[in-house]
Amino acid sequence: DTHKSEVAHRFKDLGEEHFKGLVLVAFSQYLQQCPFEEHVKLVNEVTEFAKTCVADESAENCDKSLHTLFGDKLCTVATLRETYGEMADCCAKQEPERNECFLQHKDDNPNLPPLVRPEVDVMCTAFHDNEATFLKKYLYEVARRHPYFYAPELLFFAARYKAAFAECCQAADKAACLLPKLDELRDEGKASSAKQRLKCASLQKFGDRAFKAWAVARLSQKFPKAEFAEVSKLVTDLTKVHTECCHGDLLECADDRADLAKYMCENQDSISSKLKECCDKPLLEKSHCLAEVENDEMPADLPSLAADYVESKDVCKNYAEAKDVFLGMFLYEYARRHPDYSVMLLLRLAKAYEATLEKCCAAADPHECYAKVFDEFQPLVEEPQNLVKQNCELFEQLGEYKFQNALLVRYTKKVPQVSTPTLVEVSRNLGKVGAKCCKLPEAKRMPCAEDYLSVVLNRLCVLHEKTPVSEKVTKCCTESLVNRRPCFSALELDEAYVPKAFNAETFTFHADMCTLSEKEKQVKKQTALVELVKHKPKATKEQLKGVMDNFAAFVEKCCKADDKEACFAEEGPKFVAASQAALA
């Protein structure tokens, strides 16, 4: 598909509103520290330029690539060197190196203040005064904090954000209407960001073969009635979409995503019976709906896999003829029969099958050698099953907060070198697996839990890559994408770790503790818990529980006191001394 002007092509395909939104997201994800007004100015300049190209595709510079146009625009920012330091060096490079340079400088943990939610009346006034600016600000603030957020999906979130304000700012009780909707968007947004970050990590760190394997497994579970060739086509197209978005090519990505949705809706009969209600929706909703669609029912008459993949004398011949297709078909056939398995487990099974064929097809009697290959799958299947069972039992016994604390202790002991804020964030999110997955029926627990854990552990890997401190984390993160979770699960107490010196300042608290929200209080307590474990990695559960119970009692007591600050000043040192004694 060659066009004289790429920018004109995308403007016409996407329309002005989506074009401007996507360019704003792209710029905000690259230059995360730039003020909102600066980005809006750049976007307006690009949009005006695009319109001149729509009017005349052979106008000056209209034939330039989008990377060239956008990169040139970003490099006009006056404060680039002061604000971004060495990122300014990207501007001395030519495309495609310049874009690669910008991508490498995306910051997964930017030093930006947490978003504070103003009063409802203030937000509604801002929404009514200038709806366009209000929504642009939303795109900007989310995109700069989540530099890999799936851009076309962010437009969908913005549309829902707009709808929430349009509805709730007219309601009798604005807050009761709006706040739950905003909470839901925030939580869904964070989850969406983390899921997309794993897709990008998969593509960037392990290559498109890894992503394609993931997609074959997932789409085969979703569309078990679709033929292998149909699933392969969807995988090829989906890989292109995500490669583009992860590479900063947001206009192409959004355009190709729309094409994929169109294709799926025009070919429902050969894909899935579940697509119908998605296909009646407008574009952004439709694409979202298709991505989240439930698994179709499995065909009733699926034959045993053993016939083609174990019993057949032609296994090695078929494997040698077309390794990738044969393994792809194996993965497709296994996944469509097992919606009850996690994608990561399915990929481990495919990997084990491949390893067996590599070994056996070179043996004297290949058939004899691979005859028991399916038996070798059993321990691979049982490991995540047992893990889910044990952790769901623990979650049901403890409740979410204490389950998170158990994971905090577990992970701090495994990788005590990791920063406390990262351990708290990751363990809190690991702990959310309980509420998310343990209530589900047995057949849905493992895919929910293990694939969610993969997303959370990817966050640990991404943060750790920025400031590496633990060889064990680096090893688990880089050796194998599909074995990351088992690798972390297998880590034991780090015997080589030198305990952190006790710092009373870390355990000094003030009256401001009392005005924190319940969630913020939990984070404070969990931060203290991590620091305790770093100080005493061999502390027992009972010792840690005792200290944490004392801590909760101390905070509760001081928050009820008339002079809260005086209480914290007096009781704090006593708590510290008692804790040190309890852990001695």
């Epitope: 060739a229 392969s232 090829t236 294709y263 078909m329």
Partner: nanobody, 117 residues
Framework: EVQLLESGGGLVQPGGSLRLSCAAS????????MGWVRQAPGKGLEWVSL????????YYADSVKGRFTISRDNSKNTLYLQMNSLRAEDTAVYYC??????????WGQGTLVTVSS
């Protein structure tokens, strides 16, 4: 009944190019994944490429990646294989084949490609 008729084979020098065509009839061409398979003298069958009804390429054998291009024209019920930078080891009978669900179910008679100086 299903018919697949290959053409375009012949003798070509190393480094040269050929374009194979396959005219299909007897089935709804634009509903099926199609492919090319080859058999070198004295060797077994080797998959070359697979293409989805939409024109999305599903597969190329590693041995031909970057040199061969599969395409189709659904309006003409025709499958193509453009072969560039041909090598002696590409010498084979090339078969056009129709894919159904899990395997090729119909084959053409084949066209011989000989790469030799």
């Amino acid at each position: 009944e299903v018919q697949l008729l290959e053409s375009g084979g012949g003798l070509v020098q190393p480094g040269g190019s050929l374009r194979l065509s396959c005219a299909a009839s007897g089935f709804t061409f634009n509903h099926y994944t199609m492919g090319w398979v080859r058999q070198a003298p004295g060797k077994g069958l080797e998959w070359v490429s697979l293409i989805h009804p939409s024109g999305t390429v599903i597969y190329y054998a590693d041995s031909v990646k970057g040199r061969f291009t599969i395409s189709r024209d659904n309006s003409k019920n025709t499958l193509y294989l453009q072969m560039n930078s041909l090598r002696a080891e590409d010498t084979a009978v090339y078969y056009c084949a129709k894919w159904s669900s899990r395997a090729f179910d119909y084959w053409g008679q084949g066209t011989l490609v000989t790469v030799s100086s």
